[in-house]
Interface confidence: medium
């Protein structure tokens, strides 16, 4: 059963499900090595500017060291793909921890792409964004399966999707689960069924491995297949992977090169 217009009015905070034009969606194509080299200084300055990030990173780092020390005993660390470094593991643990970090991070990601200047001067999660993006690329390339069906429950927000056939993005890094039932516990307001091709399973790097988490990057695009809005229970939205789309690429490195020599603003 569908809502009438008057019933819709009570859901005062419906969020449009669209291409999330203000999302920061850098894929760092062609500048992975440059970004990695820039991380130590960048990370240090971001810790100083962002207590939530510093605290979340410290907690995750402790957990990572513990898992590394005991991993062979507990089997708690999966074999890492080539190129996967400690900081990738820490970033994934920090993101999945039950702390305010993932919440503040994603809120910032959804706004950081308003302009290049906004990203450069007001986004204090550049390191985490890069590490998560690269970690997902590494984990995905290591995986045998291509695309997979996942489920995402959203708590406290109802989405107002465009009609079937519309192209959308999720706006930030989106946590989903391979388990329908796990997602439904979070999805009292909106429940997504998603066929993702760029999401990567992060079970072995999550604070909560039992959730069978898959993390979807902000630049993956989807087609809306179907939506339903029952009067009871969550709105349901079904998405199918289309591809990827980024407005930004290597913005931090471009800015660094502009400061240190002839300005390089071409694509990488």
């Amino acid at each position: 059963q569908s809502y009438s217009i008057s019933q819709l009015d009570i859901f005062s905070q419906e969020t449009p499900l669209d291409m999330a034009p203000a999302s920061f969606d850098d894929q760092y194509a062609g500048c992975l090595a440059d970004m990695t080299a820039a991380l130590p200084d960048l990370n240090h300055s971001e810790f100083q500017a962002n207590k939530v990030y510093a605290d979340g990173w410290a907690q995750a780092n402790n957990q990572w060291q513990e898992r590394r020390a005991w991993g062979s005993v507990w089997g708690s660390l999966p074999p890492s793909p080539p190129g996967f470094r400690d900081e990738h593991g820490v970033a994934l643990l920090a993101y999945t921890a039950n702390s305010p970090l993932h919440k503040e991070f994603n809120a910032a990601v959804r706004e950081a792409g308003r302009s290049r200047a906004h990203y450069l001067h007001h986004f204090s999660f550049k390191t985490l964004h890069f590490l998560l993006t690269e970690a997902l690329q590494l984990l995905r390339s290591h995986r045998s399966r291509g695309c997979q069906q996942v489920y995402r429950g959203v708590h406290g927000l109802r989405f107002r999707p465009a009609g079937p056939g519309a192209t959308v993005r999720l706006g930030g890094f989106a946590s989903a689960s391979l388990k329908n039932v796990a997602a439904q516990q979070f999805g009292e307001d909106t429940f997504f069924g998603i066929w993702t091709c760029l999401g990567a399973p992060i079970r072995g790097y999550s604070f909560f491995p039992e959730e069978e988490e898959v993390l979807i990057p902000p630049f993956e695009t989807f087609q809306v297949i179907n939506t339903s809005r029952p009067t009871q229970g969550p709105a349901r939205i079904y998405l199918r992977a289309l591809g990827k789309r980024s407005t930004y690429n290597c913005e931090y490195i471009k800015e660094k090169k502009c400061r240190s020599g002839p300005c390089w603003l071409g694509s990488s």
Partner: antibody, heavy 122, light 106 residues
């Protein structure tokens, strides 16, 4: 549909121990990012947080009542139990259990039971 | 622990009137949450994460603030809004509630 339901005695005598049970449905007590709190409200007064428990058995108690409170859970029965020793007439209140969404430093109580009024009197 | 002070303790408003109540924290908090409670019923999550409205909450409600100062505003009072509103923080343990603002219909 998430529901929480409190049960326990409506009347206890001073110095006795109160045992309250919160039975939940619509979510699992093993869900990693959710927990259950007990909160009370004396008649005509404000809400007071008492204790919480998360899926990993992490517990926390109100500083002023810590010595009198114990919280535990039975995941298989979907129940959270609060015991409060040495009851006093000032403990007369409606006792609520509420689901926590989130965790320390950003959590809130997104679903509440209907509450059970406990009167402490001889 | 962080003490939350709500003001006013009691207020009355006419139908259609704009209503603002405040919640002041003794130390800076990251988020403020608000609950509505009507007589004889349990509290309901009303506004969370400072400004997000819970499902079913009319759009005339809004929340704002940062640091130590937060507020709940009703753009146009309706009869069904008469209730007690509590603010709550969990930026540091333990979670604490304000003493409530009782909103009556004039």
């Amino acid at each position: 549909q998430v529901t929480l339901k409190e049960s326990g005695p409506v009347l206890v005598k001073p110095t006795e121990t109160l045992t309250l049970t919160c039975t939940v449905s619509g979510f699992s007590l093993s869900n990693a990012r959710m927990g259950v709190s007990w909160i009370r409200q004396p008649p005509g007064k404000a809400l007071e947080w008492l204790a919480h428990i998360f899926s990993n058995d992490e517990k926390s108690y109100s500083t002023s009542l810590k010595s009198r409170l114990t919280i535990s859970k039975d995941t298989s029965k979907s129940q959270v139990v609060l015991t409060m020793t040495n009851m006093d007439p000032v403990d007369t209140a409606t006792y609520y259990c509420a689901r926590i969404y989130g965790g320390d430093s950003w959590g809130y109580f997104d679903n509440w039971g209907q509450g059970t009024l406990v009167t402490v009197s001889s | 622990q962080i003490v939350l002070t709500q003001s006013p303790a009691i207020m009355s408003a006419s139908l259609g009137e704009k209503v603002t109540m405040t919640c002041s924290a003794s130390s800076s908090v990251s988020y403020m949450h608000w609950y509505q409670q009507k007589s004889g019923t349990s509290p309901k999550r009303w506004i969370y994460d400072t400004s997000k409205l819970a499902s079913g909450v009319p759009a005339r409600f809004s929340g704002s603030g940062s640091g130590t100062s937060y507020s709940l505003t009703i753009s146009s009072m309706e009869a069904g809004d008469a209730a007690t509103y509590y603010c709550q923080q969990w930026s540091s343990n333990p979670p604490t509630f304000g003493a409530g603002t009782k909103l009556e219909l004039k």
